[in-house]
C-alpha cells in the first residue's frame, strides 16, 4: 500500500514539475527590466528564450522572435537545449511510468517488470529536473554577470551616437518557476526511484511447501534447486517466519528472480 | 549595431510645412520609443515629440497642435510633420530610438541631426 502511495505521488509530483518546466521554457519573462523610464514615458522590456517583449504602461505589449541575425550568446543556446532536453526526458518517463504504476494492471506483466519501469522513469525524472535546474541557474547567472556590467558600464559611445542606458535586467518570473518545477520533478524522480525498492522481489515471507522425493529427501521450493537442498550457505542464518513452527527449511536462500507468489 | 537615417530638412517659409522622416536600421528586436530633440546654439537638447512602440504620444508644449508624430512599425521609421512653422523652430533636429538590440541589451541611439531653418 505504501509503496502504491510512494509510486503514485512520485508521479503526480513529477507530473506537476514537468508542467513547470515546459511552462517556464514557454514563458517571456525570464529577465525582467530594471525598473526604467524612458524620458518619454515608461517601457518595459521582458524577455524569454524565444522571444524579446516590450512592454508600455498602458499595458499594450508588443513581442517579437528573435531571429539569427541577432547572433544570439551560446549560453542562451545551450539553456534552450537544456530546458529542451529536460522537457523531452520527462515526457518519456511520464509515458514510462504510467505503464510502470501498481495501480494499472497491462496484460500479466510481473512485478520486476514495473519495478524496471518504476526505476527508469525515476532516474529520467531526476535528469529531467536537473537539466531545468541547471538550465535556469546558468540563465540567472547570465543575469548577474550583465547586472553588474551593466552598472559599471553605464555610458559608452560612438561619438555620442550611442548611449548605453541605464537598463540591468533582473531575475524574471519563469526562473523561479523553473527552479520549483525543476524541484518537483526531482522530488518525484527520487520518490520514484524509493517506490522501486518496494516494488521489486524481495525474499519470501511464506512457508515453503515440502515435496518428498522417492530416494533422496530433498526439499523444493519456488527458487530453484540450489535453495531446495538443505546444503546452502548461511551467511543470513535468517529464518522464515512461520508462526513459530519449525519446518524442515531452516536455510533462507537469496531470493530470486522467480521468488515471488 | 543600429543606424538611424534623417532626411526632410531644408528651408522653410514662416507658417510653412516640413516633414521629416527618420529610418532605424540594423540588429533591431524591438524599438521601444522613437523621438524627436532639437538643439539651438548655446541651448540644450530638448524633446521635441516621441512615439511609443504602441502609438502613445507626447508633444513638447511649444509645438503641441502644430507638429505630429507618427511611425511605420514595418519600416521601423518615425515622421514628424510640422505645420505652421515659426522662426523659433528652427535648430537642428535629432532622431533617437530607444532600441532593445539583443538579449539583455537596450540602448538609446542618436541620428546625425537634420538641419530646419524658417525663415521669416
Known amino acids: 500500500m505504501a509503496v502504491t502511495a510512494c509510486q503514485g505521488l512520485g508521479f503526480v509530483v513529477s507530473l506537476i514539475g514537468i508542467a513547470g518546466i515546459i511552462a517556464a521554457t514557454c514563458m517571456d519573462q525570464w529577465s525582467t527590466q530594471d525598473l526604467y523610464n524612458n524620458p518619454v514615458t515608461a517601457v518595459f522590456n521582458y524577455q524569454g528564450l524565444w522571444r524579446s517583449c516590450v512592454r508600455e504602461s498602458s499595458g499594450f505589449t508588443e513581442c517579437r522572435g528573435y531571429f539569427t541575425l541577432l547572433g544570439l550568446p551560446a549560453m542562451l543556446q545551450a539553456v534552450r537545449a537544456l530546458m529542451i532536453v529536460g522537457i523531452v526526458l520527462g515526457a518519456i518517463g511520464l509515458l514510462v511510468s504510467i505503464f510502470a504504476l501498481k495501480c494499472i494492471r497491462i496484460g500479466s506483466m510481473e512485478d520486476s517488470a514495473k519495478a524496471n519501469m518504476t526505476l527508469t522513469s525515476g532516474i529520467m525524472f531526476i535528469v529531467s529536473g536537473l537539466c531545468a535546474i541547471a538550465g535556469v541557474s546558468v540563465f540567472a547567472n547570465m543575469l548577474v554577470t550583465n547586472f553588474w556590467m551593466s552598472t559599471a558600464n553605464m555610458y559608452t559611445g560612438m561619438g555620442g551616437m550611442v548611449q548605453t542606458v541605464q537598463t540591468r535586467y533582473t531575475f524574471g518570473a519563469a526562473l523561479f518557476v523553473g527552479w520549483v518545477a525543476g524541484g518537483l520533478t526531482l522530488i518525484g524522480g527520487v520518490m520514484m526511484c524509493i517506490a522501486c525498492r518496494g516494488l521489486a522481489p524481495e525474499e519470501t515471507n511464506y512457508k515453503a511447501v515440502s515435496y518428498h522425493a522417492s530416494g533422496h529427501s530433498v526439499a523444493y521450493k519456488p527458487g530453484g534447486f540450489k535453495a531446495s537442498t538443505g546444503f546452502g550457505s548461511n551467511t543470513k542464518n535468517k529464518k522464515i517466519y512461520d508462526g513459530g513452527a519449525r519446518t524442515e527449511d531452516e536455510v533462507q536462500s537469496y531470493p530470486s528472480k522467480h521468488d515471488y507468489v | 549595431q543600429v543606424k538611424l537615417e534623417e532626411s526632410g530638412g531644408g528651408l522653410a517659409q514662416a507658417g510653412g510645412s516640413l516633414r521629416l522622416s527618420c529610418a532605424a536600421s540594423?540588429?533591431?528586436?524591438?524599438?521601444?520609443?522613437m523621438a524627436w530633440y532639437r538643439q539651438t546654439p548655446g541651448r540644450q537638447r530638448e524633446l521635441v515629440a516621441a512615439?511609443?512602440?504602441?502609438?502613445?504620444?507626447d508633444y513638447a508644449d511649444a509645438v503641441k497642435g502644430r507638429f505630429t508624430i507618427s511611425r511605420d512599425s514595418a519600416k521601423n521609421t518615425v515622421y514628424l510633420q510640422m505645420n505652421d512653422l515659426k522662426s523659433e523652430d528652427t535648430a537642428v533636429y535629432y532622431c533617437?530610438?530607444?532600441?532593445?538590440?539583443?538579449?539583455?541589451?537596450?540602448?538609446?541611439?542618436w541620428g546625425q541631426g537634420t538641419q530646419v531653418t524658417v525663415s521669416s
Open positions: 512615439i511609443t512602440f504602441g502609438g502613445s504620444t
Open positions: 533617437n530610438a530607444d532600441v532593445v538590440t539583443g538579449l539583455m541589451r537596450r540602448d538609446v541611439y
Open positions: 540594423g540588429r533591431i528586436l524591438n524599438i521601444a520609443v
